[in-house]
Amino acid sequence: IIPVEEENPDFWNREAAEALGAAKKLQPAQTAAKNLIIFLGDGMGVSTVTAARILKGQKKDKLGPEIPLAMDRFPYVALSKTYNVDKHVPDSGATATAYLCGVKGNFQTIGLSAAARFNQCNTTRGNEVISVMNRAKKAGKSVGVVTTTRVQHASPAGTYAHTVNRNWYSDADVPASARQEGCQDIATQLISNMDIDVILGGGRKYMFRMGTPDPEYPDDYSQGGTRLDGKNLVQEWLAKRQGARYVWNRTELMQASLDPSVTHLMGLFEPGDMKYEIHRDSTLDPSLMEMTEAALRLLSRNPRGFFLFVEGGRIDHGHHESRAYRALTETIMFDDAIERAGQLTSEEDTLSLVTADHSHVFSFGGYPLRGSSIFGLAPGKARDRKAYTVLLYGNGPGYVLKDGARPDVTESESGSPEYRQQSAVPLDEETHAGEDVAVFARGPQAHLVHGVQEQTFIAHVMAFAACLEPYTACDLAPPAGTTD
């Protein structure tokens, strides 16, 4: 379907002229940022952004690619090099260290320099690196972590934890030898390393002792508490903070976020990761957009500003399963959260960054017709005279043989939310990819986000923009609307 207006060169000239006019009007804000928001699309490579843009457009009954995402409207863009010190293709732990702490680390470690070694507890001490969120807290700002994964997962843990093994969620996951050497599980670090004002996501089971039933799944032992030390970390967290509240469902979250007496809020909405957006029970679990809104309500009360980490963490999980439908619908909800945050904040005083920690071996090709379903088939047949989908994976669980050959695929199959796109190499889990990812920026000092940069640059831009360590002598004018 070719839109008639797009046949006319005037259409494209006019659109480009408008974009050029907007570009010419861009004025780098020379003030500091009062607030910092980093939106992290876990596994959201550029092919994911493009495919999600088309899907979001098509959900609005448009052809697809012409409708910008919320993140597309950010005026400044850079590329980020995502490699770990020891790996070309990274994981979410060491990348979190890069974009949150400003220092690259080794694969599967969090909050530690590359002098620390994966799984070697005795290499932890002395190699800790401090996140921008921690520095923001020390500067008097309120801080928050919002994610669709467990709050103890690799990406959010980068804001507060230091661990040689990203899988040490609760003490039950930490080998006895490491516990004896003093290495703490991530859940313990969540409540003890620093004072976090808002914590929203999944991960209930790591906070309670083994045998504690889950409120949502009380008859499923596997969803209950996992801790061996007998501790109730939520209770410990509440006891240390006046005005603190714990919630475990959407209704309680909405009530708490509107209560002026609540100064600290922990909301854990699933035992592990939160459900995919397409499976979410909207009466019980909040969406990423709703969690983001609740966090902003609480954090924006602080006249000194805030730091907020918002993660669309299950984009990555959809890709690992080779289920593009899941990855892309997660990306759309992530973009909805970005859009809502934009409505609740001002670009005059808030630096907002959107990026990914890494990409995935996810491709989009095959010359599909404009307006055709992003989950559909390429117009031609493959050399084996069978259909193939426009979305594919380089490797993963989508590699299946039927009678020794690649199975044919129909439009109705490929459009199913459960469908796994085919891959060239059989793996239990599809892998991350090593190419650069995009960084989108808006707000004070956003113009610094340019060119091709190390992933560590992101943390330094945030620290500089808010005049945090090591850039306290930033020489920037105070944020818009402040007097001190």
Epitope: D214, D219, Y221, N232
Partner: nanobody, 121 residues
């Protein structure tokens, strides 16, 4: 407030059997897990077996096939039938009633005083 009263502990020979029971009284929230934990001298308290109010049962690997947990929801009582007892089963056995955290105000985790089980010839 919830009270838990255990009974049934004692001295038994290896290979023998014992039945522990635990009665809960007070203001008991309907969704809960009742179970048994044990603590041997100088060791930490370990889970033995638990039973949810909905009927799900879970055992520690070390007691599977030898111990059987059962509960009577109407009487708020949980039982532990222990067969083929071994010397390494010697410990203080504690009854526990726990409600999902965040479902009720106040305490959610209650423990009995413990009953001693000694397996020795």
């Amino acid at each position: 407030q919830v009270q838990l009263v255990e009974s049934g502990g004692g001295l038994v020979q290896p290979g023998g059997s014992l039945r522990l029971s635990c009665a809960a009284s007070g203001s008991i929230f309907s969704v809960n897990t009742m179970g048994w934990y044990r603590q041997a001298p100088g060791k930490q308290r370990d889970l033995v077996a638990v039973a949810t109010s909905g009927g799900t049962i879970h055992y520690a690997d070390s007691v599977k096939g030898r111990f059987t947990i059962s509960r009577d929801n109407a009487k708020n009582t949980v039982y532990l039938q222990m067969n083929s007892l071994k010397p390494e089963d010697t410990a203080v056995y504690y009854c526990n009633l726990v409600v999902p955290y965040g479902m009720i105000a106040g305490d959610h985790d209650y423990w009995g005083q413990g009953t001693k089980v000694t397996v020795s010839s």
